[in-house]
């Protein structure tokens, strides 16, 4: 079958890295600089992406494969691809429309982004509070008081964190 | 709270220069870059170029022969210069914070270039 | 330079009635694709971002998707302050470049 259809179309032939061009007997010719072509058989190559600006080239465009961009230290990526970049905060903090805010008592962040997020409540599971939480990390619960008998466990790991969701710019 | 505040002259003559300024307030001009942004009055956006944090500049290479952006990091002001203008570059000219997407802009200033 | 074609460039369309704007990119521009809504005498605003996603505080009405080259936005119910006109933009390779607009009105 591969035989035949490169008999049919001799653009199948052309390699990632080139393209079938038309222009000259559909023989395969490189990419020009700043474009691409991922797979074989392709009739264009694609343009780079560019990362300029708030964005940095964390991969460079080759041939055969796409530029990949990040943020620039001191931001961190939003959406797939990296399409936008946020500002970081400090632990203990969340990006506001007025900049980076210190958590509300009785909420938390661990990482640069995202919301602060409340307290885990350990009555809710029959626990106590065995650390207390602070603006950058979640209590930690422990069992209940009825539960402290010798040989009974005594810390139980907080459930994980939910994903935070996008803050606001 | 991110702000960015266009001003100018409203009215420039043909030939003359076209020079505005983009105030901003609630972040780092060392840390964000600036995009000019224009629409003449009833059509679509145009982008002309971008002053990034470090100090390097972007042009569309319809304009790059007679524009210039820099920064004046004392004052907290980008500024747009466009040079030989005619009536083609009426427009309201916004300038917008660099984040990837365009996520804050200026109101915009109208500019109308008449003798 | 990329062209982005948006069609269409006008509509009009009922309180509720669901509102798809198309807009075509002349290159591939895998999903670096942002949609505004610009209100007369005010700038555009920042809805979509990234093809799909919502920014912050803008309500869940408002969708797109879409990569490669072809790329929808959508009211799934228009309401009466939805009247504008909404713009897309590629973010994927300079100069940036926005499509023509589509003017939005009710019926």
């Known amino acids: 079958f591969e035989r035949t259809r490169s008999l049919q179309d001799p653009c199948s032939n052309c390699p990632a890295g080139t393209f079938c061009d038309n222009n000259r007997n559909q023989i395969c010719s490189p990419c020009p600089p700043n474009s691409f072509s991922s797979a074989g058989g392709q009739r264009t190559c694609d343009i780079c992406r560019q990362c300029k600006g708030v964005f940095r080239t964390r991969k460079e465009c080759s041939s055969t494969s796409n530029a990949e961009c990040d943020c620039t230290p001191g931001f961190h990526c939003l959406g797939a691809g990296c399409s936008m970049c946020e500002q970081d905060c400090k632990q203990g903090q969340e990006l506001t429309k007025k900049g980076c805010k210190d958590c509300c008592f009785g909420t938390f962040n661990d990482q640069k982004r995202g919301i602060c997020r409340p307290w885990t409540n350990c009555s809710l599971d029959g626990k106590s509070v065995l650390v207390n939480g602070t603006k950058e990390r979640d209590v930690v619960c422990g069992p209940s008081p009825a539960d402290l008998s010798p040989g009974a466990s005594s810390v139980t790991p907080p459930a994980p964190a939910r994903e935070p969701g996008h803050s606001p710019q | 709270q991110v702000q960015l505040q266009e001003s100018g002259p409203g009215l420039v003559k043909p030939s003359e220069t076209l020079s505005l300024t983009c105030t901003v307030s609630?972040?780092?001009?060392?840390?964000?870059?600036v995009h000019w942004i224009r629409q003449p009055p009833g059509k679509g956006l145009e982008w002309i170029g971008a002053i990034w944090s470090g100090g390097s500049t972007d042009y569309n290479a319809a304009f790059i022969s007679r524009v210039t952006i820099s920064v004046d990091t004392s004052k907290n002001q980008f500024s747009l210069k466009l040079s030989s203008v005619t009536a083609a570059d009426t427009a309201v000219y916004y300038c917008a914070r660099d984040d990837g997407s365009f996520a804050n802009w200026g109101q915009g200033t109208l500019v109308t270039v008449s003798s | 330079d990329i062209q982005m074609t948006q069609s269409p460039s006008s509509l009009s369309a009922s309180v509720g009635d669901r509102v798809t704007i198309t807009c075509k990119a002349s290159e591939n521009v895998g999903t670096y694709v942002s949609w505004y809504q610009q209100k007369p005498g005010k700038a555009p605003k920042l809805l979509i971002y990234g093809a799909s996603n919502r920014y912050t505080g803008v309500p869940s009405r408002f969708s797109g998707s879409g990569s490669g080259t072809d790329f929808t936005f959508t009211i799934s119910s228009l309401q009466p302050e939805d009247i504008a006109t909404y713009y897309c933009g590629q973010t994927y390779s300079y100069p940036l470049t926005f499509g023509g607009g589509t003017k939005v009105e009710i019926k």
């Open positions: 609630g972040f780092s001009l060392t840390t964000y870059g």
